[in-house]
């Protein structure tokens, strides 16, 4: 019958500094199934070099990530007798370090009242048409939100954050990228922490 879609994730995360290791993991049905990983729109030759014993476990390690690895991936599993599963939801594997870092600032100030909102501004020295703001946590993967420049030809993106609360840390970094290579990002901005009053 119908094989449900597997889960695809990246360890330690999907936003990885150039030269660092990462492993893509696909987890699905029964033990007897074979796993397959593929990159959308452009074949990823590195996948064909993964040893079969790791592929059988749904493990696809990259010892040192490069621009060649960046992209949007999906996985599936199956067998000749059972057929093919649905494809997983996509995983966007991003490599950082392609360009100089942008500057992240809070307007009017990084000090915010509890329940309030704040504008975060990401500025690049070079004109880029893509920006990403990533919220970081002590024990969680960054959660990123993409944006275009706030005005045509501008090298600045504006993000609205909030409402904020004092119950957690509010840490942010931003990145710049060229939309022709949307999975190759700049170096990260310096960390910005919002100070929540109340």
């Amino acid at each position: 019958g119908h094989l449900p879609k597997p889960t695809l994730w990246a360890e330690p995360g999907s936003v990885i500094t150039q030269g660092s290791p990462v492993t893509l993991r696909c987890q699905g049905g029964q033990e007897t199934q074979e796993y397959r990983l593929y990159r959308e729109k452009k074949t990823a030759l590195w996948i064909t070099r993964i040893p079969q014993e790791l592929v059988k476990k749904g493990q696809f390690p990259i010892p040192s990530i490069t621009w060649e690895h960046a992209g949007r991936y999906r996985c599936y599993y199956g067998s000749d007798t059972a057929g093919r599963s649905e494809s997983s939801d996509p995983l966007e594997l991003v490599v950082t370090g392609a360009y100089i870092k942008p500057t992240l600032s809070a307007q009017p100030s990084p000090v915010v009242n509890s329940g309030g909102n704040v504008i975060l501004q990401c500025d690049s020295q070079v004109a880029f048409d893509g920006f990403s703001l990533c919220k970081e946590g002590e024990d969680e993967h960054p959660q990123c939100l993409n944006s275009q420049p706030h005005a045509r030809g501008s090298s600045r993106a504006i993000f609205s954050v909030g409402p904020v609360s004092p119950s957690r840390r509010w840490w942010y970094r931003c990145y710049a990228y060229d939309s022709n290579s949307p999975y190759e990002w700049s170096l990260p901005s310096d960390l910005l922490e919002l100070l929540v009053l109340g």
Partner: antibody
């Protein structure tokens, strides 16, 4: 698990014929890439068309087969190939073949085939 | 359209010997290549997929190699039962590039 093609037979030039591939031991409620491949007497293998039994229902045709050949899923265990405007050049053994290991239909369009039917001979002659 | 050129078209070899069959693609197909064995009156039988992975139940005397545009099937320690026609198949690309089979190589055993 097995595949079996319906009886082929003799068809007049310009005629129409529909071949059926019946699955035994499995059904198309599972996702497969089901294809028709033909082989003229003493010649090589030629891929004609494929259909995906997943929710996409996508089809693939060899460029030369578009227009005259139509592949479809007629039930949970049968695939058909409708052939029109047949000529002597269409005389061949027609095989039904199954594969599962494909990326997304429309990108990597076919797959390798680990299960084949025994084939059925279609002769086009007046 | 993608073309697969198989060489040689026929080859004769002795029992216990080795045969090498080449398959050349007109454009890169990465490792999306399969090899089949076909005997007269029978459908093809899958030997190798993903250029070098042995299909279930196939003897390790069959070895596939290559990537990109150049691929090889090597049959070692030849047996009389290996007399057959061998085909390569590409399954990479979109409907504009085409998917299909090589012309075949007939192997005769002396």
């Amino acid at each position: 698990q097995s595949l079996e093609e319906s009886e082929g037979g003799l068809v007049k030039p310009g005629g129409t014929l529909t071949l059926t591939c019946t699955a035994s031991g499995f059904s198309f409620s599972s996702s497969y890439c089901m294809c028709w491949v033909r082989q003229a007497p003493g010649k090589g293998l030629e891929l004609i068309a494929c259909i995906y039994t997943d929710s996409s229902g996508a089809t693939y045709y060899a460029s030369w087969a578009k227009g005259r050949f139509t592949i479809s899923k007629s039930s949970s265990t049968t695939i058909t190939l409708q052939m029109t405007s047949l000529t002597a050049a269409d005389t061949a053994t027609y095989f039904c073949a199954r594969g599962w290991d494909y990326e997304d239909p429309g990108y990597t369009d076919t797959t390798y085939f680990s299960l084949w039917g025994p084939g059925t001979l279609v002769t086009v002659s007046s | 359209e993608l073309d697969l050129t198989q060489t040689p078209s026929s080859v004769e070899a002795a029992v216990g010997g080795t045969v090498t069959i080449k398959c050349q693609a007109s454009q890169t197909i990465y490792t999306n290549l399969a090899w089949y064995q076909q005997k007269p009156g029978q459908p093809p039988n899958l030997l190798i997929y993903a250029a070098s992975t042995l299909a279930s139940g196939v003897s390790s005397r069959f070895k596939g190699s290559g990537s990109g545009t150049e691929f090889t099937l090597t049959i070692s320690d030849l047996e009389c039962a290996d007399a057959a026609t061998y085909y390569c198949q590409s399954y990479y690309g979109s409907s504009t590039t085409g998917n299909g089979f090589g012309g075949g190589t007939e192997v005769e055993i002396k």
